[in-house]
């Protein structure tokens, strides 16, 4: 009886089992009656991620550099490239096909997280006691000034965009 | 429908080079593995070699110093070349596809001055 | 290379009665993948082989249910249940585990 199904690894074709290329390899010609399956390793700048039988493999990705992309991993037969962004920038997709500039945290934000070549930068408001007088893609809320310690006493408050202003204590004369 | 055909000389002198070529149809050279049989008269099947779909070869030892096989996918032509003959080599040379039942009808070579 | 060795050479047999044939080989045939590339032919005067059996036990399309093959490793059998005169011929094993692929003397049957 011919075989309805086949074990892992493997395909039915004309009422036979064949195996399945291993990664890296295309099929070129099915098991017969008298031979095993045909596979061939992929080209160069080709690869195929899968136990298969397709008669052709995937083209690398290309990482354009006029997309802001450069190469995070070369890709091999078994594996696709991996693309990430030039310094500044970050992917606009989790298939890291473009790349736009990180963002900038405005005066009154500070950074909550550097970007990376895949996320933006997270920013987060200042919140008292902090303030960010910059827009910055790297700076964090600093917090303010604390006069005491310098025996100074707050002469202007700080807000979330100012330090405060210290100032000398007024003596008892 | 599936068809392979030898064609090459039906004599040939000891010490020269035959040539012989396989024509095909209904299938392609890319995808379909063919190889090549022989049969001396009154004898047995001898394999000669392969060629394979993705373009490699696989000969008989016996034969190997002496055998050439080649193809020209375009022209679904598979070929075979063998040298310094002798007459030992006077036989039914067959080509075959690698699946299912499909032979040429075969072509005599015979080996002689 | 695999040295296929078949018995009987000849086999005279009675039209309706059983036939078999035996073939050895001088190494396993079963492949790294687990299958075994072992066939049956047979030939009859003036034309080219025909397949029968491919992988020790498998009837090729259009060949009669009275033949059967059966084996593993290094002995193999090929049956016929009833021998019709149609069947005379030469009977050839051959396997296409092993580069070279090699074929068996050949078995002569005949009908008495």
């Known amino acids: 009886e011919p075989p309805t199904a086949c074990r892992e690894k493997q395909y039915l074709i004309n009422s036979q089992c064949c195996s399945l290329c291993q990664p890296g390899q295309k099929l070129v010609s099915d098991c017969t009656e008298f031979t095993e399956t045909e596979c061939l390793p992929c080209g160069e700048s080709e690869f195929l991620d899968t136990w298969n039988r397709e008669t052709h493999c995937h083209q690398h990705k290309y990482c354009d550099p006029n997309l802001g992309l450069r190469v995070q991993q070369k890709g091999t037969s078994e594996t696709d490239t991996i693309c990430t962004c030039e310094e500044g920038w970050h992917c606009t997709s989790e298939a890291c096909e473009s790349c736009v500039l990180h963002r900038s945290c405005s005066p009154g934000f500070g950074v909550k997280q550097i970007a990376t070549g895949v996320s933006d930068t997270i920013c987060e408001p200042c919140p008292v006691g902090f303030f960010s007088n910059v827009s910055s893609a790297f700076e964090k809320c600093h917090p303010w000034t604390s006069c005491e310690t310098k025996d100074l006493v707050v002469q202007q408050a700080g807000t979330n965009k100012t330090d405060v202003v210290c100032g000398p204590q007024d003596r008892l004369r | 429908q599936v068809q392979l055909q030898e064609s090459g000389p039906g004599l040939v002198k000891p010490s020269q080079t035959l040539s012989l070529t396989c024509t095909v149809s209904?299938?392609?050279?890319?995808?379909?593995?063919v190889y090549w049989v022989r049969q001396p008269p009154g004898k047995g099947l001898e394999w000669i070699g392969m060629?394979?779909?993705?373009?490699?070869?696989d000969y008989n030892p016996s034969l190997k110093s002496r055998l050439t096989i080649s193809k020209d996918t375009s022209k679904s032509q598979v070929s075979l070349k063998l040298s310094s003959l002798t007459a030992a080599d006077t036989a039914v040379y067959y080509c075959?596809?690698?699946?299912?039942?499909?032979w040429g009808q075969g072509t005599l070579v015979t080996v002689s001055s | 290379d695999i040295v296929m060795t078949q018995s009987p050479l000849s086999l005279p047999v009675t039209p309706g009665q059983p036939a078999s044939i035996s073939c050895r080989s001088s190494?396993?045939?079963?492949?790294?993948?687990?299958?075994?590339?072992l066939h049956w032919y047979l030939q009859k005067p003036g034309q080219s082989p025909r397949l029968l059996i491919y992988?020790?036990?498998n009837r090729f399309s259009g060949v009669p249910d009275r033949f059967s093959g059966s084996g593993s490793g290094t002995d193999f059998t090929l049956k016929i249940s009833r021998v019709e005169a149609e069947d005379v011929g030469v009977y050839y094993c051959?396997?296409?585990?092993?580069?070279?692929?090699?074929f068996g003397g050949g078995t002569k049957l005949e009908i008495k």
């Open positions: 075959v596809r690698t699946d299912g039942d499909y």
């Open positions: 209904g299938f392609s050279l890319s995808r379909y593995s």
């Open positions: 060629m394979w779909g993705g373009g490699s070869t």
């Open positions: 190494q396993s045939l079963a492949s790294s993948q687990g299958n075994t590339y």
């Open positions: 992988k020790v036990s």
């Open positions: 051959s396997q296409s585990t092993h580069v070279p692929w090699t």
